[in-house]
């Protein structure tokens, strides 16, 4: 029987061209943390194995950062960046539990300010 | 340099018994899940069994399921299939394959002719 | 299960040519989708894994795209050393399945 809970950041907002860490923590369960494995909708970004370590896709390496913990950091974020985010923690002998974060990159206050005050 | 090696093929009549075995070197093997993967004469492949880095877990194509076991020694570095009530249809290559991360099959071993035949 | 078909099974092209072949899950795989190459009585050899990952040493010309349920892999200039069957396979989920392969012929 699958006790455990995921924890996540839920909901989260960064401004482009910064950084943000996507976290997400597995409680109430004794289960074994065997991998995880960080996607965006349909692209996997990251995994995280007990054994072997981190690997990182290659198209993310530039901007994808392992950790702090079992989490993520993006950088450089843009705006097609933006969406949802998931942890799947493959744990023995509970199975896999999954994490959502919806991220969202917003047009930096810089560029804000810029656009609204012009210098003559 | 990652080299696997697996042995144990041969003939045997229907209903018989074998056991393969799939030496590993050049890595840590009890790092890495594995997987047997098969292919007979002039067909594609088929994925048979994989077995977890910790042997804490295993799973099996149902055409397989109940007839082999998939074990490992990681103080031998070498990954088994053990096959009995064996069929015709058995008749393949058997391949052990390196599995990082549970996903993709880096190494391959050369493969191990099975023949099931009377 | 989830089936995995390919297309086309065979295909000739001459060296040079851009090649493509496809894969479509029965259902979606997310990009755990990975292509392997064969040569007769040789073991299969890795060239992307999870649909657009260059596997180390394989050369450029490879690459993948896709994800969800169609899938794509594409050799830009065909090379004499490329002739030969190339199966996707998904490990989105046990039992893990192949593709039918295709074989790539000269013409």
């Known amino acids: 029987m699958m006790t455990g809970t995921i924890e996540t950041t839920g909901n989260i907002s960064a401004e482009k061209g910064g950084s943000i860490i996507l976290q997400c923590h597995l409680s109430s369960t004794t289960a074994q943390v065997t991998q995880v494995n960080w996607e965006q909708q349909d692209q996997l970004l990251a995994i995280c194995n007990a054994d072997l370590g981190w690997h990182i896709s290659p198209s993310f390496k530039d901007r994808v950062a392992p950790g702090p913990g079992l989490g993520l950091t993006l950088q450089s974020l843009t705006v097609n960046d933006t969406g949802e985010y998931f942890c799947i923690y493959h744990t023995y002998p509970d199975g896999t539990y999954t994490g959502r974060i919806f991220l969202e990159v917003l047009e930096s206050s810089v560029a804000e300010h810029g656009a609204r005050f012009q210098i003559p | 340099e990652v080299q696997l090696l697996e042995s144990g093929g041969g003939l045997v009549q229907p209903g018989g018994s074998l056991r393969l075995s799939c030496a590993a070197s050049g890595f840590t093997f009890s790092s890495y899940s594995m997987h047997w993967v098969r292919q007979a004469p002039g067909k594609g492949l088929e994925w048979v069994s994989s077995?977890?880095?910790?042997?804490?877990?295993?799973s099996y194509a149902d055409s397989v399921k109940g007839r082999f076991t998939i074990s490992r020694d990681n103080s031998k570095n070498t990954l088994y299939l053990q096959m009995n009530s064996l069929r015709a249809e058995d008749t393949a290559v058997y391949y052990c394959?390196?599995?990082?991360?549970?996903?993709?099959?880096?190494?391959w071993g050369q493969g191990t002719l099975v023949t099931v035949s009377s | 299960d989830i089936q995995m078909t390919q297309s086309p099974s065979s295909l000739s092209a001459s060296v040079g040519d851009r090649v493509t072949i496809t894969c479509r899950a029965s259902?979606?795989?997310?990009?755990?989708l990975n292509w392997y190459q064969q040569k007769p009585g040789k073991a299969p050899k890795l060239l992307i894994y999870a649909a657009s990952s260059l596997q180390s040493g394989v050369p450029s010309r490879f690459s993948g795209s896709g994800s969800g349920t169609d899938f794509t892999l594409t050799i830009s200039s065909l090379q004499p050393e490329d002739f030969a069957t190339y199966y996707c396979q998904q490990s989105y989920s046990t039992p893990l399945t192949f593709g039918g392969g295709t074989k790539v012929e000269i013409k």
């Open positions: 259902q979606s795989i997310s990009s755990y």
């Open positions: 394959a390196r599995v990082p991360y549970d996903y993709w099959m880096d190494y």
């Open positions: 077995i977890k880095s910790s042997a804490s877990y295993s």
